[in-house]
């Protein structure tokens, strides 16, 4: 169970979805993607302190053990809980076509 949405750290420091603007060149996609020429990439960034947005019991245990054994047990990671699909117009051997990617953009985030 997700444990809490209260961030004990400075504002915006905890795990959340952030949008980063990236060109096709930034992403290394310029040789196979035609559009969009710039992508507003929504990604999960931030710390996972205490029991913040713990995805499940395993994440809660990980948080507790990380406090006890930080050298052995890493803190939970901020990762997508769900995704928004996105369409890319891409070059293929047979010509230009559409492809929808279901796991390209983070919709919301949790700690795991």
């Amino acid at each position: 169970a997700r444990n809490g949405d209260h961030c004990p750290l400075a504002a915006a420091a905890c795990c959340a979805a952030h949008t980063v603007r990236a060109s096709l060149e930034d992403l290394g996609w310029a040789d196979w993607v035609l559009s969009p020429r710039e992508v507003q990439v929504t990604m999960c960034i931030g710390a996972c302190p205490s029991q913040f947005r713990a995805a499940n019991m395993h994440a809660q245990i990980k948080t507790s053990l990380h406090r006890l054994k930080p050298d052995t047990v890493p803190a939970p990671c901020c990762v997508p809980a769900s995704y928004n699909p996105m369409v890319l117009i891409q070059k293929t051997d047979t010509g230009v076509s559409l492809q929808t990617y279901d796991d390209l953009l983070a919709k919301d985030c949790h700690c795991i």
Epitope: S35, P36, M86
Partner: antibody, heavy 117, light 106 residues
């Protein structure tokens, strides 16, 4: 497989409001970069872009017709609606809806003929 | 708005002939699409972003251009190429189409 189908009244009288529906399948308007566009074509003439509606509900209209156009969508039922108010005989045309991916009318409906008479 | 002017309005070509259709824009555009519309059907894309062949389009079609001048070339015309051809820009709203070129086969 992407399909789109336009439906409309067929015949309308001048000054009335034209209501068109685009029903589609094979894609979702929840997908970033996806939209539906409307294009019309008077018989024997060229294509005229009317409007686009996007996944994020952004709407863009042909400036020459903007005051008369209204776009909306029902994402859960895969439908897009276009209303054109105060029609006259110059609005007689075949009306197409098309799937727009970013900047490309990738798939088109078969069109529906609307006659203002 | 950006006005696209296509020429010629009507072109007659023989089987196997190489032809070029042109599209001139009233202001510079970054890219151009080309659509083909056969009689009684809806348009379909031939060329995406100036020079990229759409999936399933025969390789005898090609596109080029930049700025205000773009062209569509058919290297060896076939009977099935009889159609109307439209250029289309989306660099700025309102999106616009050219007036079209009707290709007739002799």
């Amino acid at each position: 497989q992407v399909t789109l189908k336009e439906s409309g009244p067929g015949i309308l009288q001048p000054s009335q409001t034209l209501s068109l529906t685009c029903s589609f399948s094979g894609f979702s308007l929840n997908t970033h970069g996806m939209g539906v566009g409307w294009i019309r074509q008077p018989s024997g003439k060229g294509l005229e872009w009317l409007a686009n509606i996007w996944w994020n509900d952004d709407k863009y209209y042909n400036s020459a017709l903007k005051s008369r156009l209204t776009l909306s969508k029902d994402t859960s039922n895969n439908q897009v609606f276009l209303k054109i108010s105060s029609v006259d005989t110059a609005d007689t045309a075949t009306y197409f809806c098309a799937q727009v991916a970013w900047d490309w009318f990738a798939y088109w409906g078969q069109g529906t003929l609307v006659t203002i008479s | 708005q950006i006005v696209l002017t296509q020429s010629p309005a009507i072109m007659s070509a023989s089987l196997g002939e190489e032809i070029t259709l042109t599209c001139s824009a009233s202001s510079s555009v970054r890219y151009m699409h080309w659509y083909q519309q056969k009689s009684g059907t809806s348009p379909k894309v031939l060329i995406y972003s100036t020079s990229n062949l759409a999936s399933g389009v025969p390789s005898r079609f090609s596109g080029s251009g930049s700025g205000t001048f773009y062209s569509l070339t058919i290297s060896s015309v076939e009977a099935e190429d009889a159609a109307d051809y439209y250029c289309h820009q989306w660099s700025s709203y309102p999106w616009t189409f050219g007036g079209g070129t009707k290709l007739e086969i002799k």
